[in-house]
Amino acid sequence: LSTCKTIDMELVKRKRIEAIRGQILSKLRLASPPSQGEVPPGPLPEAVLALYNSTRDRVAGESAEPEPEPEADYYAKEVTRVLMVETHNEIYDKFKQSTHSIYMFFNTSELREAVPEPVLLSRAELRLLRLKLKVEQHVELYQKYSNNSWRYLSNRLLAPSDSPEWLSFDVTGVVRQWLSRGGEIEGFRLSAHCSCDSRDNTLQVDINGFTTGRRGDLATIHGMNRPFLLLMATPLERAQHLQSSRHRR
Amino acid sequence: LSTCKTIDMELVKRKRIEAIRGQILSKLRLASPPSQGEVPPGPLPEAVLALYNSTRDRVAGESAEPEPEPEADYYAKEVTRVLMVETHNEIYDKFKQSTHSIYMFFNTSELREAVPEPVLLSRAELRLLRLKLKVEQHVELYQKYSNNSWRYLSNRLLAPSDSPEWLSFDVTGVVRQWLSRGGEIEGFRLSAHCSCDSRDNTLQVDINGFTTGRRGDLATIHGMNRPFLLLMATPLERAQHLQSSRHRR
Amino acid sequence: ALDTNYCFSSTEKNCCVRQLYIDFRKDLGWKWIHEPKGYHANFCLGPCPYIWSLDTQYSKVLALYNQHNPGASAAPCCVPQALEPLPIVYYVGRKPKVEQLSNMIVRSCKCS
Amino acid sequence: ALDTNYCFSSTEKNCCVRQLYIDFRKDLGWKWIHEPKGYHANFCLGPCPYIWSLDTQYSKVLALYNQHNPGASAAPCCVPQALEPLPIVYYVGRKPKVEQLSNMIVRSCKCS
């Protein structure tokens, strides 16, 4: 099948570099590098850098990229984030903060702006900044279902920690449902795990964005790091290629 | 790097077949096919076929083989199974069958016979035959810990079903602990998931091996299909090669 | 995906999974494996053209990357993507053994 | 495993992951990717000898299977095993975009 020759390491590197040139453009579905004529001067906006850093950092509970990947996952995914609706919103009044649960609500019109069609969503992660924790805590994540019912999604055993740490839950399926449904506001509940015979069901873990009594600058910083959904999706204009070029090679 | 020639499909097939010859022997760490001189005549024993079929069948909750595999996983794993201690054993008297839980105990001397050293264990699955289920049920698996405490392991959402179905839980870490500890009897608890505010915590799912009032042949069939641990481990004699050839090429 | 569904029903010339059934007796001359009698091992075959050079027309080439060189290798190669294990039954002396062999069955291929 | 830990600190001649840092400006002449400035792409290189023929001495060969031809390929090939994604920031017009590119960084290789 093949006849081996002496390997020219420099040639291999050059071929790999050229292949990467094609790979990046191809993943972005660009025929050539984008024009830089309209790029505003100065550094990148803070929010963009924050989003880039969120994407770059692997966080607790997030699995490494699975292999093999479906064909559509070859292409680049645009990353956006949607912050949780702030806790002074009236939606929270319906759900009394209990000792065993906290609630997180999201505006579906913001989700739809980021991901207009359910099929475009590639991954959705709920990210929470947990503050330091003195004891081990077993927590569960629920999705708001119909009326006042909640559907169990997943759980996590949180080890004690002296420093804040980002947690990530894969909520792709849930967000895809929300995008299909078109409700106005949807939510999650984080609860202490309650065993059938245990009596102490207090949620010990402190999640950034819920601690009361903060004022001024601290509240702002706190608010920026409140729970959010990190979304990875095929951009609409790129997806239209797939809609129109659906046939197999 | 290579010069392509016309592909000779038959040559490729022959090379693949010969490579498989080496692969199988190599995975079994055999220098040549084993002698068949002492093989008893007649068909394979029932128990062996049952074990073979258990291994061959993918069951609910069992993931496909992960890639990449650690180096040691290249080699073949011997498959054995250890049945749950029968429910008339006195160990069960200490744990009153409640409406929300069932208990499953295993004899660690049987586990040790199958896997003499914890490091040899590659995978352990707890397999349960669930009988038909009318409503969706969320169940949790716990490991018996110290004294009377239980440690949460995993959970499963069971969909309604008209027919019996095998369930599988990955309990590799737990069984490895048991093999390290040298207790006499160890156990699991399968419980209904109890949410902090829910009141109905009954375990609706019927697991084969616990239903009362069976007699004669039916009880035997029932007993054969009672919960068991499916163990995959490197045989001791094969592992000794690994012990002595640990150094990198 | 270049899997058995697609490849076995097409005449794909490029990288694809190819059908190969191994009969232990006929193909390997082995009588010592009691179960199964054989298995669908399959294999990967077909070119993965290196599709980049500065004088190549960008747009034509870029559309082919996904299939022919998704990993941007200097020398892409047709290799297994999804693999499955194979349990076997054989005897050691008088004792029957059930063993599982990892990564024995090729279900799909990829250019890598 | 043939990963960066092992391969970058050894003089392995056979299949291994090799170091390659791509600087977008220097290597590709690109100024349009604003973050990162470059990344460790790496690549796989090195022979995976086909190690089976009926006249080969069984025992010597069998020990080498694990490394050189674990998938029992007719023509084993050195390819990526573990890959990682790369997020980038670039502009489309005046709008900054963060996108994640899958399988861009080679962490380890295997003969397949």
Partner: antibody
Framework: EVKLQESGPGLVAPSQSLSITCTVS????????VSWVRQPPGKGLEWLGI???????IYQSGLISRLSISKDDSKSQVFLKLSSLQTDDTATYYC?????????WGQGTSVTVSS | DIVLTQSPSSLAVSAGEKVTMNCKSS????????????LAWYQQKPGQSPKLLIY???TRESGVPDRFTGSGSGTDFTLTISSVQAEDLAVYYC????????FGGGTKLEIK
Amino acid sequence: EVKLQESGPGLVAPSQSLSITCTVSGFSLTTYGVSWVRQPPGKGLEWLGIIWGDGTTIYQSGLISRLSISKDDSKSQVFLKLSSLQTDDTATYYCAKHYFVMDYWGQGTSVTVSS
Amino acid sequence: DIVLTQSPSSLAVSAGEKVTMNCKSSQSLLNSRIRKNYLAWYQQKPGQSPKLLIYWASTRESGVPDRFTGSGSGTDFTLTISSVQAEDLAVYYCKQSYNLWTFGGGTKLEIK
């Protein structure tokens, strides 16, 4: 070429369950969704449910307790199961490839619920 | 649930004439942030399965003749056939995907 083919039992007795298989070719079930739609004789179309590429399912609210959709990606098959059938479940059942919209449909399989 | 009402329920026109049919939604189908309406039109010829004509209220599916045009926004939508052909004999359904998926009752087009 994209193709979808439904196969079902034709006749089902009341109170029994209906199982239909949709076998697809020309696209991957890991990338696209598949919707199920039915059409009673001489009437309009009714969406029943969808299974997305990642396995997420969504059902019409009126059928949640009776409907189940699953799939086998490796066999390129999608399965519909509808339990406790009544005579008004008599219809032609279609599966459709779902991207932004239902862009390719199978020919449909006719199901009659009758004793 | 969103209800779609189609009018007229049937109409008969001669070949070559222009025809319009309407679809009214019980709530807005417009995603104002991306300026797209979640409405599609399907054609079902006698004895056949439905076929996609238009999505996002006005985007024509590839391969659909340009005599078919979709328009409207919010709650009121129209399908226009500029010059009816004999092969356009069919029932036309609108479908919303703003909140799950529901179809209108259909408009039956007959050719005089």
